[in-house]
């Protein structure tokens, strides 16, 4: 039994880091393998993660962490019974994938303005809370070409757009994702999408 693709890990910078790897053949990850992880910190304990299958030869493990700070470094040991298959380390702050924003809501009752709001996925005492920026994706269910991205570079989790920038009488969907420049993170997953019917009063045209 050998590791074909070494574990790579990403952290949500709050409580979970996810590690994925591939074995050289079909493997029952949960029965055959264990990933041990330990914070490099005086008198910290080693913890055991039981991996799950992720495709025939792929494995994934969700490492639970009390908290994350920028200095944290973890040792990782992948075991098959008594055999050490791989040894490495992981610094969560260098491999951050933020949590996805939640509670995306479209408010359509603000004159002819659409107000989109969502929730920051982090609590106020987490470093990322004040460092997230967002991308909002809006698309038409009827017209695949009607697809747009709005970059929200301010901290407030909201976006205002004129309803008239979208077609009237058509259903639209929106979703939002986050990233943090300070840690050069990857983008989060998209939030669940929300749907609304776009309707607004066309301006009266004089001939």
């Amino acid at each position: 039994m050998k590791v074909l693709q070494e574990p790579t890990c990403v952290s949500d910078y709050m409580s979970i880091s996810t590690c994925e790897w591939k074995m050289n053949g079909p493997t029952n990850c949960s029965t055959e393998l264990r990933l041990l992880y330990q914070l490099v910190f005086l008198l910290s304990e080693a913890h055991t993660c039981i991996p799950e299958n992720n495709g025939g030869a792929g494995c994934v493990c969700h490492l639970l962490m009390d908290d994350v700070v920028s200095a944290d470094n973890y040792t990782l040991d992948l075991w098959a019974g008594q055999q050490l298959l791989w040894k490495g380390s992981f610094k969560p702050s260098e491999h951050v994938k933020p949590r996805a924003p939640g509670n995306l809501t479209v408010h359509t009752n603000v004159s002819d303005t659409l107000l989109l709001t969502w929730s920051n996925p982090y609590p106020p005492d987490n470093y990322l809370y004040n460092h997230l920026t967002y991308a909002v994706n809006i698309w038409s269910e009827n017209d695949p070409a009607d697809f747009r991205i709005y970059n929200v570079t301010y901290l407030e989790p909201s976006l205002r757009i004129a309803a008239s920038t979208l077609k009237s009488g058509i259903s639209y969907r929106a979703r939002v994702r986050a990233w943090a420049q300070c840690y050069n993170t990857t983008w989060s997953e998209w939030s669940p999408s929300t749907k609304w019917h776009n309707s607004y009063r066309e301006p009266f045209e004089q001939h």
Partner: antibody, heavy 120, light 108 residues
Framework: EVQLLESGGGLVQPGGSLRLSCAAS????????MHWVRQAPGKGLEYVSG????????YYANSVKGRFTISRDNPKNTLFLQMSSLRAEDTAVYYC?????????????WGQGTTVTVSS | ETTLTQSPDTLPLSPGDRASLSCRAS???????LAWYQQKPGQAPRLLIY???RRATGVPGRFSGSGSGTDFTLTISRLEPEDFAVYYC?????????FGQGTKLEIK
């Protein structure tokens, strides 16, 4: 209420032994690394020893290495410090201390201390 | 092993004043592992700040911590009578625990 209560201090002759105990209440001892910190009369704080949450790993300051032994009985929610070959410079108030991992070494709960006096 | 040096040894101030206490490490350390404690006569120390700048539960907002590398500061924005005590910085590293020698904040 979260509390640590030390006991076992007293007067001992140089070269003698003493065993300190620390009873924890209001929290589960097995979830925390635990430590002993001491303070000589009129002096500052000095780190003595620590033990990981399951007891598998221990650490000692150079000044007590080979003479002191830290241990714990998680089911009984108790921490111990066995002190032997005691010297006059070990005279101090000994505090039992909890470290919250999320506090990255911040010692968030302290006992009231027990006094050890080494004198002939 | 890293040593921590606090200054000044004694700081005479009056209630209402702003206090700045310094803690200097002999080599660069992670700010994540730097803490501050307050100790009053006859009492056990009390955790004030951990991770250089994060206030422990129940600590008033007038206490704040800052710094990085080798230089760290505990600031008390407006001294109350109950703040006059001895303050210690502490480093909890990957292989050792160290305390500074303390700064005594006394009433002028």
């Amino acid at each position: 209420e979260v509390q640590l209560l030390e006991s076992g201090g007293g007067l001992v002759q140089p070269g003698g032994s003493l065993r300190l105990s620390c009873a924890a209440s209001g929290f589960t001892l097995s979830s925390y690394a635990m430590h002993w910190v001491r303070q000589a009369p009129g002096k500052g704080l000095e780190y003595v020893s620590g033990i990981s949450s399951n007891g598998g790993s221990t650490y000692y300051a150079n000044s007590v290495k080979g003479r002191f032994t830290i241990s714990r009985d998680n089911p009984k929610n108790t921490l111990f410090l066995q002190m032997s070959s005691l010297r006059a410079e070990d005279t101090a108030v000994y505090y039992c201390v909890r470290v919250k991992v999320g506090y990255r070494g911040g010692m968030d709960v302290w006992g009231q201390g027990t006094t050890v006096t080494v004198s002939s | 092993e890293t040593t921590l040096t606090q200054s000044p040894d004694t700081l005479p101030l009056s209630p209402g004043d702003r206090a700045s206490l310094s803690c200097r490490a002999s080599q660069s350390v992670s700010s994540a592992y730097l803490a501050w404690y307050q100790q009053k006569p006859g009492q056990a120390p009390r955790l004030l700040i951990y991770g250089t700048s994060r206030r422990a539960t129940g600590v008033p907002g007038r206490f704040s911590g800052s710094g990085s590398g080798t230089d760290f500061t505990l600031t008390i924005s407006r001294l109350e009578p109950e703040d006059f005590a001895v303050y210690y910085c502490q480093l909890y590293g990957s292989s050792s625990v160290t305390f500074g020698q303390g700064t005594k904040l006394e009433i002028k």
